[in-house]
Interface confidence: medium
């Protein structure tokens, strides 16, 4: 089943989904929040690691098809390497081909998530809302 | 707990969502699934019937704070009343003052949900995507 | 850029001891600091980390059950571990370390010097 | 918590030789995996991150490979500076583990 259902099916089952902190999104026994105060990209990492979470990892477009859906621009976890100019996740994982698409909005070292599966490059000092994600084991 | 929570907190409990349809989104005990196929407001209301669910629903801004996240136009269980110029939800409640900004795009009877709690209101035959919701008990 | 450590010291059991670590040579505000120990001929035991700027945000190790607290002063560019209710097998070498970039969080290139803590009565 | 299993504990080399050391998590963390070394009274020094990528100023003898669970530092020909203590460590995420360390002791 995607997000984007392209034919009515009946679900066979309900589930549970999670567990996640209370209040939170859950799609795919992954768990999102979204938060509206703005904050430079570091205070965000610390906002979302500070609830046992990081910043958003785009890891699977099938996974994480809710996030076609999302409007305005919110942090990544996603950095910019410049020893080797790779773009990376939080946790040091390369960020896979053909997931994001890069756009060079600013220049910086942190990037925006934006809906469709796009990364805004941006300053990583300027204020933005944020998403935080956990993904349950 | 806001979607948008305006402070760090430190989650006290991890909690389950649901139950819901596999793969659908959980959020406040609320199940959601957003789907890409356009239908007029009458198959969408069929689909998300099919599926023991809705038409989406909106009751509360705090309950559906995610709401305020959703791009584009996606058909809604809202429809307009001829005979006493209301606007009623499939299961027959009215509207609440101040849920929705209703904005007339289209002479219509039928409404599409829009982000920020907006009710744009359309010709109920056209074709759109949709939102379905079941409220967990 | 370098992290300079101080306290220590000889403590009894049950005793208490804060370690600080004073930054220089970049913005303190960005980074994580983290606190490593290492026992005598033993390995590396992350304890936990806090977030320089305003949030002040930790993060501590499970086995740290409350006995550790981590603060930090950002007009000092300093971070500090409190070590509480100490016993022999606290005995350690106790290093901060700073991530590789601001955005990194778990990847230390800059390191302390080391700080020995020893608990004995 | 990831577990982190480093082999062998210990190893006797000659200057010029190759060497490899393990580490093995105990579930995926993707190539989020460094490597330090140590050298006595000392404290870590950053080799490796990203699983492979080498840390500026560091010789290029050094190597890292493996993604997943499996991971792998090489010395392509070992240097008298080289005998040390080597220690993965994840940063997939918190908390984090250090593997028990590989000691690189002169034949």
């Known amino acids: 089943n995607s997000l984007f259902n392209q034919e009515v099916q009946i679900p066979l089952t309900e589930s549970y989904c999670g567990p996640c902190p209370k209040n939170w999104i859950c799609y795919k026994n992954n768990c999102y929040q979204f938060f509206n105060e703005s904050k430079n990209w570091y205070e965000s990492q610390a906002s979302c690691m500070s609830q046992n979470a990081s910043l958003l990892k785009v890891y699977s477009k099938e996974d994480q098809d809710l996030l076609k859906l999302v409007k305005s621009y919110h942090w990544m976890g996603l950095v910019h390497i410049p020893t080797n100019g790779s773009w990376q996740w939080e946790d040091g994982s390369i960020l896979s081909p053909n997931l994001l698409t890069i756009i060079e909005m600013q220049k910086g070292d942190c990037a925006l998530y934006a809906s469709s599966f796009k990364g805004y490059i941006e300053n990583c000092s300027i204020p933005n809302t944020y998403i935080c994600m956990q993904r349950t084991v | 707990n806001s979607l948008f929570n305006q402070e760090v907190q430190i989650p006290l409990t991890e909690s389950y969502c649901g139950p819901c349809p596999k793969n659908w989104i959980c959020y406040k005990n609320n199940c959601y699934q957003f789907f890409n196929e356009s239908k007029n407001w009458y198959e969408s209301q069929a689909s998300c019937m099919s599926q023991n669910a809705s038409l989406l629903k909106v009751y509360s801004k705090e309950d559906q704070d995610l709401l305020k996240l959703v791009k584009s136009y996606h058909w809604m269980g809202l429809v307009h009343i001829p005979t006493n110029g209301s606007w009623q939800w499939e299961d027959g409640s009215i509207l609440s003052p101040n849920l929705l900004t209703i904005i007339e795009m289209q002479k219509g009877d039928c409404a599409l949900y829009a982000s920020s709690f907006k009710g744009y209101i359309e010709n109920c035959s056209i074709p759109n995507t949709y939102i379905c919701m079941q409220r967990t008990v | 850029q370098q992290l300079e450590q101080s306290g220590g010291g000889l403590v009894t059991p049950g005793g208490s001891l804060k370690v600080c670590c004073k930054a220089s040579g970049f913005d303190f505000t960005t980074y994580w600091m983290t606190w490593v120990r290492q026992a005598p001929e033993k390995g590396l035991e992350w304890i936990g980390c806090?977030?320089?700027?305003?949030?002040?945000?930790?993060y501590y190790a499970n086995w740290v059950n409350g006995r550790f607290t981590l603060s930090r002063d950002i007009d000092q560019s300093t971070g500090c571990l409190q070590l509480n209710s100490l016993t022999a097998a606290d005995t350690a070498m106790y290093y901060c370390?700073?991530?590789?970039?601001?955005?990194?969080?778990?990847?230390?290139?800059?390191w302390g010097q080391g700080t020995m803590v020893t608990v004995s009565s | 918590d990831i577990q982190m299993t480093q082999s062998p504990s210990s190893l006797s080399a000659s200057v010029g030789d190759r060497v490899t050391i393990t580490c093995q998590a105990s579930q995926d963390i993707s190539n989020a995996l460094n490597w330090y070394q140590q050298k006595p009274g000392k404290a870590p020094k950053l080799l490796i991150y990203a699983a492979s990528t080498l840390q500026s100023g560091v010789p290029s003898r050094f190597s890292g490979s493996g993604s997943g669970t499996d991971f792998t530092l090489t010395i392509s020909s070992l240097q008298p500076e080289d005998f040390a203590t080597y220690y993965c460590q994840h940063s997939n995420s918190f908390p984090l583990t250090f593997g028990g360390g590989t000691k690189v002791e002169i034949k």
């Open positions: 370390a700073r991530p590789g970039y601001p955005s990194w969080s778990k990847t230390f290139d800059l």
């Open positions: 806090i977030h320089g700027g305003d949030s002040g945000a930790t």
